[in-house]
């Protein structure tokens, strides 16, 4: 029985040219995480973190994607094309598969600075 839940950073915005951390957290289960897959909005695979064999990054993103922190993923040098959905898929034993969704909006620098000024601390 799958008792766990995935918590994500939800809907986030970041500045064009900047960086952002995509983070999912699996809680309420003792299941062992065997692999985490990070997919982009078009369902292309960005990165894999295998429990035994470590991180693997899609070659086209090697310069812009950094593993971590933890099981998360850091996207750097953001472009407007990075806007969209991102999915974390947690493969676990014995529970099975958990999936989380994050929506990233990349904003033009001036817009991002403006919206940041009005965020509640």
């Amino acid at each position: 029985m799958m008792t766990g839940t995935i918590e994500t950073t939800g809907n986030i915005s970041a500045k064009k040219g900047g960086s952002v951390i995509l983070q999912c957290h699996l809680s309420s289960t003792m299941a062992q995480v065997t692999q985490v897959n990070w997919e982009q909005h078009d369902h292309s695979l960005l990165a894999i973190r295998n429990a035994e064999l470590g991180w693997h990054i899609y070659p086209a993103f090697k310069d812009r994607v950094a593993p971590g922190p933890g099981l998360g993923l850091t996207l750097q040098s953001l472009t407007m094309n990075d806007t969209g959905e991102y999915f974390c898929t947690y493969h676990t034993y014995p529970d099975g598969t958990y999936r989380g969704r994050i929506f990233l909006e990349v904003l033009e620098s001036s817009v991002a600075e403006h919206s940041a000024r009005f965020q509640i601390p």
Partner: antibody, heavy 117, light 106 residues
Framework: EVQLVQSGAEVKKPGASVKVSCKAS????????IYWLRQAPGQRLEIIGR????????YFVDKFKNRATLTTDTSASTAYMELSSLRSEDTAVYFC??????????WGQGTLVTVSS | DIQLTQSPSFLSASVGDRVTITCKGS??????LVWYQQKPGKAPKLLIY???NLQSGVPSRFSGSGSGTEYTLTISSLQPEDFATYFC????????FGQGTKVEIK
């Protein structure tokens, strides 16, 4: 042209160690991880472990954690796999392979290691 | 980890035949499936990646398809150089291989 050339066949006694080499050419050696895999007679391929030539970091499948050692000589663009405490079940063809993202795009020709008393 | 089962394990065929090999996963492979060709004493050769993408330099008679747990490799017209062993590999959950399918001359 990317090439991985492995050392020749070995015959070892139980309890001994074997060291297999894999010389890479045709690409920048430090830009891709090297995997080591093996195929025992009549069995499917299984992964032993991985080494990142850029920093020497190694990763192992649990089964091989205590017996396998992976190293590289970046100046010679060569990777090495040493397996200790050999037993008859280690008789297999051992492969090195380059990983490109998530799959192996170039492989060595394989090295047959026979463990026999 | 996902277990991959290929069928058939052995296949006898003639030059010009259309050949289909199946690879079935114990769980959803999510299209993260690769096909290799291997000849005795030679390095395995990458044929198809991500289910249906032909690797550069591989003849167009090779094609791949599938989704979920079931995938196929098709050789539209078998050539003399195609007699070999073919195996699948997945990376959706763990990195695992099928047991191989040996294509022999009938």
């Amino acid at each position: 042209e990317v090439q991985l050339v492995q050392s020749g066949a070995e015959v070892k006694k139980p309890g001994a160690s074997v060291k297999v080499s894999c010389k890479a050419s045709g690409y920048t050696f430090t830009e891709h991880s090297i995997y080591w895999l093996r195929q025992a007679p009549g069995q499917r391929l299984e992964i032993i472990g991985r080494i990142d030539p850029k920093n020497g970091r190694t990763y192992f499948v649990d089964k091989f954690k205590n017996r396998a050692t992976l190293t590289t000589d970046t100046s010679a663009s060569t990777a090495y796999m040493e397996l200790s405490s050999l037993r008859s079940e280690d008789t297999a063809v051992y492969f090195c392979a380059r990983i490109d993202g998530f799959y192996f795009d170039f492989w060595g020709q394989g090295t047959l290691v026979t463990v026999s008393s | 980890d996902i277990q991959l089962t290929q069928s058939p394990s052995f296949l006898s065929a003639s030059v010009g035949d259309r050949v289909t090999i199946t690879c079935k996963g114990s769980q959803n492979v999510n299209k993260y499936l690769v096909w290799y060709q291997q000849k005795p004493g030679k390095a395995p050769k990458l044929l198809i990646y991500s289910t249906d993408n032909l690797q550069s330099g591989v003849p167009s008679r090779f094609s791949g398809s599938g989704s979920g747990t079931e995938y196929t490799l098709t050789i539209s017209s078998l050539q003399p150089e195609d007699f070999a062993t073919y195996f699948c590999y997945q990376y959706n959950n763990g990195f695992t291989f099928g047991q191989g399918t040996k294509v022999e001359i009938k």
